[in-house]
Interface confidence: low
């Protein structure tokens, strides 16, 4: 194995419109040009890239659905973070929709956890 076969750690370039790829890759927040000679900045609020890449296009920012609120807006290096509206939650096994939280517990049970954007209310038997 030659000296060149090991990979020097890539340092993130400061944010700028255009820069040169390092070993054929562009830093987060950029994509590569068609001729692979330039790194082009993603458009803030429109698209993004999260890691070193040779994408010809940045990834499109997610738009929050109705029933969701935007917790973090899309930057050039991070996708939008959407969260279910108050009173609704997202189940792990069906993450595509926000479900309504239950309003109360069945008879004989007490609420031990409130509704959050990630989980329904939690009920336990009174005696437990």
């Amino acid at each position: 194995i030659t000296r060149q076969s090991l990979d020097p750690q890539r340092r993130a370039a400061p944010q700028q419109k255009r820069s040169s790829p390092i070993e054929g890759l562009c830093p987060p927040g950029h994509h590569i040009s068609e001729d692979s000679r330039e790194c082009i900045s993603c458009k803030y609020g429109q698209d993004y890239s999260t890691h070193w890449n040779d994408f010809l296009f940045c990834l499109r920012c997610t738009k929050c659905d109705s029933g969701e609120v935007e917790v973090n807006s899309c930057t050039t290096t991070r996708n939008t973070v959407c969260q279910c509206e108050e009173g609704t939650f997202r189940e792990e096994d069906s993450p595509e929709i926000c479900r309504k939280c239950r309003t109360g517990c069945p008879r004989g049970m007490v609420k031990v956890k409130d509704c959050t954007p990630w989980s329904d209310i939690e009920c336990v038997h009174k005696e437990s």
Epitope: R3, Q4, S5, D7, L25, H51, W52, D54, L59
Partner: antibody, heavy 121, light 118 residues
């Protein structure tokens, strides 16, 4: 949950061929580089081949160059390793591993359980 | 001589701290490389533990507790994996690795078998 499941291993005669598959789920397969790493019985890890997120760039260890071909089908969330002209020294457990970068080897952050390839007459 | 050298075996008592070593051959400079560490328990696939370049540039693997930490000694051309509060489940083979240019390869060390003494 990220899952990588290898299949296609088995017993093959020297000079024979085998095609390994790796089914990926739980992440956006088309934006990650992928690799095959093998481990001979009782031995250490040996990187075999790597492919970038789009399948445009493929890389091989000298020991398999010209005999093995790595490929991917992003529509099927699948990674493949076509192994030809197999030798006894190719006997190993073959692991499919995800790269934490799109193209460059950064860290092999998730691994499958592996599939055993035995080359013997 | 391999590019990455690891002692074949090390042992330490339950609850203690141990430091595993990965020495880069001296025709390479560890100062410009990240060091990766993987754990492999018997009968299991490898698991990514961490990547270490510097104190300000490092990353922990998925669900890897902070008991596992990385460091480097540039003068000695070595990478280290420290494991504190050793537990029985830490008994495993530990491989260091270094990434290669443009995704070309991952160079693995030969591995260190860690034994946890009760």
């Amino acid at each position: 949950e990220v899952q990588l499941v290898e299949s296609g291993g088995g017993l093959v005669k020297p000079g024979g061929s085998l095609r390994l598959s790796c089914a990926a789920s739980g992440f956006t397969f088309s934006t990650y580089g992928m690799h095959w790493v093998r481990q001979a019985p009782g031995k250490g890890l040996e990187w075999v081949a790597g492919i970038n997120y789009s399948g445009n760039n493929k890389y091989y260890a000298d020991s398999v160059k010209g005999r093995f071909t790595i490929s991917r089908d992003n529509a099927k969330n699948s990674l493949y390793l076509q192994m030809n002209s197999l030798r006894a020294e190719d006997t190993a457990v073959y692991y499919c591993a995800r790269d934490s970068s799109t193209t460059r080897t950064r860290a092999l952050d998730y691994w499958g359980q592996g599939t055993l390839v035995t080359v013997s007459s | 001589q391999p590019v990455l050298h690891q002692p074949p075996a090390m042992s330490s008592a339950l609850g203690t701290t141990i430091r595993l070593t990965c020495t880069l051959r001296n025709d390479h400079d560890i100062g410009v490389y990240s060091v990766y560490w993987y754990q492999q328990r018997p009968g299991h696939p490898p698991r990514f533990l961490l990547r270490y370049f510097s104190q300000s540039d490092k990353s922990q693997g998925p669900q890897v507790p902070p008991r596992f930490s990385g460091s480097k000694d540039v003068a000695r051309n070595r990478g280290y994996l420290s494991i504190s509060e050793l537990q029985p489940e830490d008994e495993a083979m530990y491989y260091c690795a270094m990434g290669a240019r443009s995704s070309v390869t991952h160079v693995f060390g030969s591995g260190t078998q860690l034994t946890v003494l009760s």
